[in-house]
Interface confidence: medium
Amino acid sequence: DNPSLSIDLTFHLLRTLLELARTQSQRERAEQNRIIFDSV
């Protein structure tokens, strides 16, 4: 494949990692909110 596309393989990986990080962050926020709610 040509060089213009080769960076896309990196892009695919980076985007997948970004999305995993966001999902993890959302889970942590939800857990934090649950702890706060439960303590009220």
Epitope: D1, N2, L5, D8, F11, H12, L18
Partner: antibody
């Protein structure tokens, strides 16, 4: 040489269906995410749908405007990506472009006209 | 959704002069290593063509009079010396998250 060739466009009545195809060549199709982007006559660009790889379980994503009506799919053995369009509305009238990866390459587009 | 706002909507520049198009995102589209912003050129009757990838990476075969810069929420496409064939509509687009969105477009004409 890389090529993306769309087909399947045409005139359809509101509520009708169409299936667009995009045949790819000149690169390792199975390695890349594929997208559909559309452009209404005289308007700007709107991303429509994306399909990822076998290793991503062929994950799909859609614009809110088409969610539940359009389905993107791919056949890696044929190096082809599809867009099944159901319950078409007049506002779906546009040129539909198939694109590869981060929208690196675009086909010439196929015109979909939804009109009674 | 991330909203991309381009300015100006249209631009007339003399041949050989510099043209600058701006794109502002409603939230950051950058990490410490990558800027998820891209620039396209579209001429009448043709599909868009990728010019700049990841804010500043010139696509293969694109003349080096085109350049891109920026990070976070503010990005710029610059044409250092405008040529007649640069008459087109230019779009920015982000790939930070789903849905990918485009700017409204900037029409560039020769003065």
């Amino acid at each position: 040489e890389m090529q993306l060739v769309e087909s399947g466009g045409g005139l359809v009545k509101p509520g009708g269906s169409l299936r667009l195809s995009c045949a790819a060549s000149g690169f390792t199709f199975s390695n890349y995410w594929m997208n559909w982007v559309r452009q209404a006559p005289g308007k700007g660009l709107e991303w429509v749908a994306e399909i990822r790889l076998k290793s991503n379980n062929y994950a799909t994503h859609y614009a809110e405007s088409v969610k539940g009506r359009f389905t993107i799919s791919r056949d890696d053995s044929k190096s082809t990506v599809y867009l099944q369009m159901n319950s078409l509305k007049t506002e779906d009238t546009a040129v539909y472009y198939c694109t590869v990866g981060t929208l690196v390459y675009w086909g010439q587009g196929t015109l979909v006209t939804v009109s009674s | 959704d991330i909203v991309l706002t381009q300015s100006p909507d249209s631009l007339a520049v003399s041949l050989g002069e510099r043209a600058t198009i701006n794109c502002r995102a409603s939230q950051s589209v950058s990490t410490s290593t990558y800027n998820y912003m891209h620039w396209f050129q579209q001429k009448p009757g043709q599909p868009p063509k990728l010019l700049i990838k990841f804010a500043s990476n010139l696509e293969s075969g694109v003349p080096d009079r085109f350049s891109g810069s920026g990070s976070g929420t503010d990005f710029t496409l610059t044409i250092s010396s405008l040529q007649a064939e640069d008459t087109a509509v230019y779009y920015c687009q982000h790939s930070w998250e789903i849905p990918y969105t485009f700017g409204q477009g900037t029409k560039l004409e020769i003065k």
